[in-house]
Interface confidence: low
């Protein structure tokens, strides 16, 4: 037999909170358990689902979980079925709602001295206890002629008077919690002695020296007082007007007339109605002086024939907002057609050359009128006046290529060299008429040039080939002073180019012929073995038929190249002692010696007391310090060549002698001892 060892039980539950209906079964066979709600099977959801045999509620819902739950256990083999006891929830909840008018049927029917009943639509279980509020202040039974039942949701005001006017709200609480009205009710009961607005003044905009009228009327029983004030709270009456409102008139019906308005009259005017009872009613209206600012300038516009273009006219700031229209040749543009106005825009559809000219945007309001012209040019495709021609330009001289075109507007001309855009620099210059100037023609300027002339309507282009007429020149020019090493072989090259290949020959500057051991081989002067007599001035002559000849003068010096007799050695010195770095060089002309230490040249005139460079080139450093350590370079140079050699200098601390060491013990490394 199937036995329920845990039966579900009816229980209190809170709306939206967790709950559990327990059910546990004992049976000889395998049983499956399911739940019924009011006789229908319960489907699992995320909110309500079976947990083992029990039914779990993640959040109790007063609508979906009301009814009778039953746990059912069934043995599918034997068909035996058992049902638990019924269980239900006593769900506690509270739900906010609005304050509504119950009596009379509509707000329009609320009159002084009638009964008014308000209903608080807060519901809940158990039945809530209600509290009423007017303008946030709690109301209690019998207070100010209102009957309140704290057990009921109704608030009755009998009779209702102006003193009951205000914002009514309610709150309620029960075992679940508290809620307040979601929407409150404003009760407005007119008191005939209170001033009520019949006609409110409106803001006005007037032009300077024009007149302005404000209308204002109140009603009350007895009739109310009416007073006008301006800005600084100055009253305006027909008897006492402020100095700046001399031209103000207050009419019997409450209207205020201002004539010949000035800027100082602009501002806020207050119309105040005061009944026999109740607060003053203040109405405000502003008098604005009409104004209009200047319009921004238009940039000239260039359009192409056949296209559709628009020009937007930004209206000037003004009060009231200015109206805008376009004119052309003194005639206002229509709102449709080929050339028309659309909103603030001038629209030119399928532009023709005849559309060019001045168009005017007008803006106007009470304060006056403004206008601004825009000049519209209809672009044409450029035509040729002079195309670039194939040209021969002389090397080293300025060269010109012409590209003269005409169009509307003035065309822009750009030049390309070998398909690369030419940007103006020190060699290239494009004149305003489109002509290209090559300031100093070079051999590699011989190529294709293309000019493109453009307007927004289109472009034309043409190209020309430039041939450079090369000048007769040395390539490269020989060095004017050159050295040759005594008793060695030497060569002095000379080459030149021109429109025709030039012939090249050497001669001595004094006109004498070259010695037999010196040969001139296609422009290269060759010395088999340099002697002292080979020194002197020589001339290289390059010539061809069409261009004549050019000369280059070279002074040759014969020298014994530098060698070092003595080179500085790696040196280690005790701190405080003297270091000697020896360096001697020989050569002809006699070389000069310079020293470089720690990557800077040692200037003999600025060495200070610790350093000295001897005539023979040796460097001495007295009282050496650790910072003197480093590489020292001896540089020997004359007018023909330069050589250098370097050695490191180490500065070390002098060791303290140990007892075991005799007075004559040698230092642990090779030293200079001074």
């Amino acid at each position: 037999a199937i036995v329920f060892i845990k039966q579900p039980s009816s229980q209190d539950a809170l709306q939206g909170r967790r709950a559990l209906l327990r059910c546990e079964v004992e049976a000889p066979g395998l049983v499956h358990v399911y739940w019924l709600l009011d006789g229908a099977p319960v489907q699992d959801t995320e909110r309500r689902f079976t947990q083992g045999s029990s039914l779990s509620f993640a959040a109790v819902d007063r609508l979906q979980d009301s009814g009778t739950f039953q746990c059912v256990a069934r043995d599918d083999v034997t068909g035996e079925e058992a049902r638990s006891a019924n269980a239900s929830f006593n769900i506690k909840w509270i739900e906010a709602g609005p304050v509504v008018l119950k009596h009379p049927a509509s707000e329009a029917e609320i009159q002084p001295q009638t009964q008014v009943t308000l209903r608080c639509h807060i519901d809940g279980h158990p039945r809530p206890t209600y509290q009423w509020f007017r303008d946030g202040t709690p109301l209690s039974d019998g207070q100010s002629n209102n009957t309140v039942s704290s057990k009921e949701r109704n608030l009755t005001l009998r009779p209702a008077g102006p003193e009951h006017s205000g914002l009514y709200s309610c709150c309620a609480h029960n075992a679940f919690g508290q809620a307040c009205s979601s929407q409150n009710f404003t009760l407005s009961i007119a008191d005939e002695s209170f001033a009520r607005v019949v006609l409110a003044p409106q803001d006005v905009i007037v032009a300077r020296n024009e007149e302005a009228m404000f209308h204002c009327q109140f009603s009350a029983q007895p009739p109310p007082n009416l007073q006008w004030l301006f800005e600084d709270e100055t009253p305006i009456t027909n008897r006492s007007r402020p100095p700046h409102l001399r031209r103000a008139t207050v009419f019997a019906n409450g209207s205020l007339l201002l004539t010949q308005v000035r800027p100082r009259n602009a501002g806020v005017y207050r119309c105040i109605g005061q009944g026999q009872r109740g607060p003053p009613v203040i109405l405000e209206a502003t008098l604005h002086l009409a104004e209009i600012e200047d319009m921004p300038l238009f940039e000239p516009r260039v359009f192409t024939a056949g296209s559709e273009e628009r020009v937007t006219c930004l209206p000037p700031k003004g009060l009231p907002e200015p109206s805008v229209w376009w004119e052309h040749a003194g005639v206002r543009l229509p709102t449709h057609g080929r050339v028309y106005q659309k909103g603030h825009e001038l629209v030119l559809a399928s532009i023709a050359e005849s559309d060019a000219g001045v168009y005017t945007c007008h803006a106007a309001n009470l304060a006056g009128q403004r206008r601004q012209d825009v000049n519209i040019t209809v672009a044409t495709v450029p035509t040729w006046l002079k195309k670039p021609q194939d040209s021969q330009l002389e090397e080293g001289k300025p060269g010109y290529l012409h590209c003269l075109t005409q169009a509307t507007p003035k065309p822009t001309v750009v030049w390309y060299r070998n398909q690369m855009l030419i940007s103006e620099d020190s060699r290239f210059e494009v004149f305003k008429n489109g002509t290209l100037r090559i300031n100093n023609v070079e051999v590699y300027d011989g190529t294709w040039y293309r000019c493109v002339s453009s307007t927004p309507a289109g472009s034309i282009e043409a190209q020309a080939r430039v041939q450079v007429l090369e000048k007769l020149k040395f390539t490269p020019p020989p060095q004017p002073q050159q050295c040759m090493e005594f008793d060695k072989e030497a060569t002095v090259p000379c080459s030149a180019t021109g429109r025709e290949k030039p012939t090249i020959k050497w001669e001595r500057a004094d006109g004498s012929s070259l010695p037999e051991w010196v040969t001139d081989n296609a422009g290269t002067l060759h010395f088999a073995r340099v002697t002292r007599d080979d020194a002197g001035n020589y001339t290289c002559i390059a010539s061809n038929g069409p261009q004549g000849q050019i000369r280059a003068h070279v002074q040759l010096t014969v020298a014994v190249f530098i060698t070092f007799k003595v080179e500085p050695e790696r040196t280690t010195v005790y701190q405080g002692h003297t270091a000697l770095l020896q360096c001697e060089a020989q050569g002809d002309p006699k070389p000069l010696i310079q020293w470089k230490g720690k990557d800077r040249i040692l200037d003999p005139t600025k060495l200070g007391p610790r350093m000295h460079i001897f005539q023979n080139g040796s460097l001495v450093i007295h009282d050496v310090a650790p910072e003197d350590s480093g590489r020292y370079t001896c540089i020997a140079g004359n007018s023909c060549n330069i050589k250098h050699t370097e050695a490191p200098l180490y500065v070390v601390d002098k060791p303290v002698p140990e007892e075991s060491e005799g007075p004559g013990s040698p230092p642990p490394y090779k030293m200079i001892q001074t």
Partner: antibody
């Protein structure tokens, strides 16, 4: 129906230069419209960067002017954005958009491309 | 530049309710030069309103715009489920054109 499509790298290094291209289809870039770039940092509002007309005329937002170059290639029916000296503050979705003829509001937009500035 | 401020930042309403979105400019904007856009997550903005009150092509008549000077309003009369997204206003009367920071309309 005009369509706009942004393309370019999704990642740019700090101090580098962003290069994006917007391809226009279904219409000519030489129409009377201006073509704009607009960006939107993640979770934030929209910022107009600048615009170009097919003639090459440009207008830029003064706050970005020193770093922005917008160019147009009529032959390819596309326009491009270059934004230099990129920082993390330039991380955003970049949109290209078309101005309604003559007015500075946008009637067509690209779908946008996210550009992240990170080393 | 003109600073454009939208309020509220977030608006919580139920489907079928009326939405009122506000847009305020730091200087007066000609009424011809204010636009509203709608932006769905992961998509580009879409033009809703231009010239303060003119609906763009294909925009339903539940969207309407009004205002002048510095204060402008977008009204959605009956909210549909697809309307719960972000809305931006943009002034284009003064360069540079500027956008508001957006108003998110969410389901209550």
């Amino acid at each position: 129906q005009v369509q706009l499509q942004e393309s370019g790298p999704g990642l740019v290094k700090p101090s580098g230069t962003l290069s994006l291209t917007c391809a226009v289809s279904g219409g000519s870039i030489s129409s009377i419209n201006w073509w704009s770039w607009v960006r939107q940092p993640p979770g934030k509002g929209l910022e107009w960067i600048g615009e170009i007309y097919h003639s090459g005329s440009t207008n830029y937002n003064p706050s970005l002017k020193s770093r922005v170059t917008i160019s147009v290639d009529k032959s390819k029916n596309q326009f491009s954005l270059k934004l230099s000296s990129m920082t993390a503050a330039d991380t955003a979705v970049y949109y290209c958009a078309r101005d309604e003829s003559g007015y500075d509001y946008f009637d067509y937009w690209g779908q946008g491309t996210l550009v992240t500035v990170s080393s | 530049e003109i600073v454009v401020t939208q309020s509220p930042a977030t608006l919580s309403l139920s489907p079928g309710e009326r939405a009122t979105l506000s847009c305020r400019a730091s200087q007066s904007v000609s009424s011809s030069y204010l636009a509203w856009y709608q932006q769905k997550p992961g998509q580009a903005p879409r033009l809703l309103i231009y010239g303060t009150s003119s609906r763009a092509t294909g925009i339903p008549d539940r969207f309407s715009g009004s205002g002048s000077g510095t204060d402008f309003t977008l009204i959605i009369t009956r909210l549909e489920p697809e309307d719960f997204v972000v809305y931006y206003c943009q002034q284009y009367g003064t360069s540079p054109r500027t956008f508001g920071q957006g108003t998110k309309v969410e389901i209550k």
